[in-house]
Interface confidence: low
């Protein structure tokens, strides 16, 4: 059985294809190749005569075809027009003809694709975006990549138009990409340059920094406002509801207690039309917003009951503070034997009794802050009672 085989079957444009012949009969006069599925003299490519070992170009010869003595046909520099069927007719010595038909497919070397978009500046949670991979070519597979990865499964991603169009439903700020499309055919593949989306969003609720609430008079107040937004938000400041300025930063030098109040940052995105505000309370006070931990000291920590007295002192470097004392979680003084002096910095117990043994600590505080000392332990001992008979033991 006479057969033909295309090597290769899928050919890149500009390359060559060899139509191989198998089971060629013996005792031949010659053979001819034709373009198409049947023998048609007008579509003869080349004929070969065994006796003269000479090939004769036919009407369909383009100058790119070479016939070999084994009847194989080489077609060089193929074009897409060469795609299709080729028929070999063998003329045997008994004048009986045999035919075999083969085919091959020529694919173009694919160009570098590009991505077009129906909306390059979509609004978050509102707009959809359709990407289209260009050009549209036949017999081409279209693939998409997001962040160099194949498409994730997502209800917001839709492929259509033979996978040539990728639609993002309800874009988010995380959908910036990059996006790439790849086109493939059996002989080549090519990927587009990456495309990124400029997703318009925000502003989110602004953040005012630093987070400090308390400031001392004479300090400089410097507040900065930031809200995630694309395009970047436009900012304005209000103090106690009164507009101050349209800047991202608010600076007030040498503040006084009169600068206390509510500070509002207003963020606006002119594209989305959205606004967000954040209010921060600022307190300007001489009081320390952070009271340091006080130190507690005892004149002695082990005393004799009903005999000794003890002085506990609470030390602090902070000014404008008050001091209070605690014993076993109870506020002091709790008896007439306990006295506070020197602005409550000293707690005196005179005399000390058994029930005074335990843990003491002090707390310093102002209207906006407080801090307590580490505890101190007071031990109360009693001397051994004298012998009732006055005699020494033994």
């Amino acid at each position: 059985q006479l057969t033909t085989e295309s090597m290769p079957f899928n050919v890149a444009e500009g390359k060559e294809v060899l139509l191989l012949v198998h089971n060629l009969p013996q005792q031949l006069f010659g053979y001819s190749w034709y373009k198409g599925e049947r023998v048609d003299g007008n579509r003869q490519i080349v004929g070969y005569a065994i006796g003269t070992q000479q090939a004769t170009p036919g009407p369909a010869n383009s100058g790119r075809e070479t016939i070999y003595p084994n009847a194989s046909l080489l077609i060089q520099n193929v074009t897409q027009n060469d795609t299709g069927f080729y028929t070999l007719q063998v003329i045997k010595s008994d004048l009986v003809n045999e035919e075999a038909t083969g085919q091959f497919h020529v694919y173009p070397e694919l160009p570098k694709p590009s991505i077009s978009s129906n909306n390059s500046n979509p609004v978050e949670d509102k707009d959809a975006v359709a990407f289209t991979c260009e050009p549209e070519t036949q017999d081409t597979t279209y693939l998409w990549w997001i962040n160099n990865q194949s498409l994730p499964v997502s209800p917001r991603l839709q492929l259509s138009n033979g996978n040539r169009t990728l639609t993002l439903l309800s874009v988010t700020r995380n959908d910036t990409g990059p996006y790439e499309c790849e086109i493939q055919n059996p002989v080549s593949a090519n990927r587009s340059d990456p495309v990124t989306l400029n997703v318009t969003y925000g502003p989110d609720t602004p953040t005012i920094s630093p987070s400090d609430t308390y400031y001392r008079p004479g300090a400089n107040l410097s507040l900065s406002c930031y809200a995630a937004s694309n395009p970047p938000a436009q900012y304005s400041w209000l103090i106690n509801g009164t507009f101050q300025q349209s800047t991202q930063e608010l600076f007030i030098p040498n503040i006084t207690v009169n600068n206390s109040g509510s500070y509002t940052c207003h963020a606006n995105n002119s594209v989305t039309g959205c606004n967000r505000t954040t209010v921060k309370t600022i307190i300007v006070t001489e009081l320390s917003p952070v009271v340091a931990k006080p130190q507690i000291k005892a004149s002695k920590t082990t005393v004799t009951g009903d005999k000794d007295s003890v002085n506990l002192t609470c030390s602090t470097n902070d000014t404008g503070i008050s001091i209070r004392w605690f014993f076993k979680n109870q506020s002091l003084p709790s008896s007439e034997r306990m006295k506070l002096s020197q602005g409550n910095t000293t707690l005196s117990i005179n005399p000390v009794k058994r029930e005074d043994a335990g843990t003491y600590w002090c707390e310093v505080f102002n209207p906006i802050s407080k801090n307590q000392s580490d505890p101190i332990m007071l031990n109360v001992n009693y001397n051994a009672l004298p012998q009732e008979n006055g005699l020494s033991p033994g």
Epitope: G14, L74, Q80
Partner: antibody
Framework: QVQLVQSGSELRTPGASVKVSCKAS????????LSWVRQAPGQGLEWMGW????????TYAQGFTGRFVFSLDTSVSTAYLQISSLKAEDTAVYYC???????????WGQGTLVTVSS | DIVMTQSPDSLAVSLGERATINCKSS????????????LAWYQQKPGQPPKLLIY???TRESGVPDRFSGSGSGTDFTLTISCLQAEDVAVYYC?????????FGQGTKVEIK
């Protein structure tokens, strides 16, 4: 790696013949055509023609028919250029060059200087 | 036959400067079926065989530095060396492989100024 190694320099008298060889290695010899290019002293490049290494079929450029013969010995992956009836104007460096898949000559032999002098 | 004409015949360029060589073909070498220009550029240094630099008029051969670039279409083509190096001193040839006989330009000698 692909290499085309040509035979050494030749000195001939007018009327004599010379045969230059070009041995290929590093690829399938019969898959790529081989061209011959001439470069006369101080002159440019002149394409002489090529030989189909699959069929052995040579193609000669105008001016290189008759005295010039391209041939092959595929068993040793070698192409030959034979010039007969040498003339003084045949003095030149002769290059073999592989016809790349796209057509241009992607690999060249080192060249063979043929000097024709009485 | 297609005649290839290069200009200039020689040029001297300072190191680091741009060198531009032109090549004109007497017939169109653009193949409309694949939109390829069947034109190549070669570099030949003294005592060496030519080396393929560019094919399809603008595609750099593997391993060729990117300071070499080709452009043009149809009948007018250009080889540009964007930043001339000392090792670029050579004769440069264009060649059409659109139709037989394949033909070369006469060559352009590039020297250091």
């Amino acid at each position: 790696q692909v290499q085309l190694v040509q035979s050494g320099s030749e000195l001939r008298t007018p009327g004599a013949s010379v045969k230059v060889s070009c041995k290929a290695s590093g690829y399938t010899f019969t898959s790529y055509g081989l061209s011959w290019v001439r470069q006369a002293p101080g002159q440019g490049l002149e394409w002489m023609g090529w030989i189909n290494t699959n069929t052995g079929n040579p193609t000669y450029a105008q001016g290189f028919t008759g005295r010039f013969v391209f041939s092959l010995d595929t068993s040793v992956s070698t192409a030959y250029l034979q010039i007969s009836s040498l003339k003084a104007e045949d003095t030149a460096v002769y290059y073999c060059a592989r016809k790349g898949i796209w057509g241009p000559f992607d690999y060249w032999g080192q060249g063979t200087l043929v000097t024709v002098s009485s | 036959d297609i005649v290839m004409t290069q200009s200039p015949d020689s040029l001297a360029v300072s190191l680091g400067e741009r060198a531009t060589i032109n090549c004109k073909s007497s017939q169109n070498v653009l193949y409309s079926s694949n939109n390829k220009n069947y034109l190549a550029w070669y570099q030949q240094k003294p005592g060496q065989p030519p080396k393929l630099l560019i094919y399809w008029a603008s595609t750099r051969e593997s391993g060729v530095p990117d300071r070499f670039s080709g452009s043009g279409s149809g009948t007018d083509f250009t080889l540009t060396i964007s930043c001339l190096q000392a090792e670029d001193v050579a004769v440069y040839y264009c060649q059409q492989y659109f139709s037989s006989p394949w033909t070369f330009g006469q060559g352009t000698k590039v020297e250091i100024k």
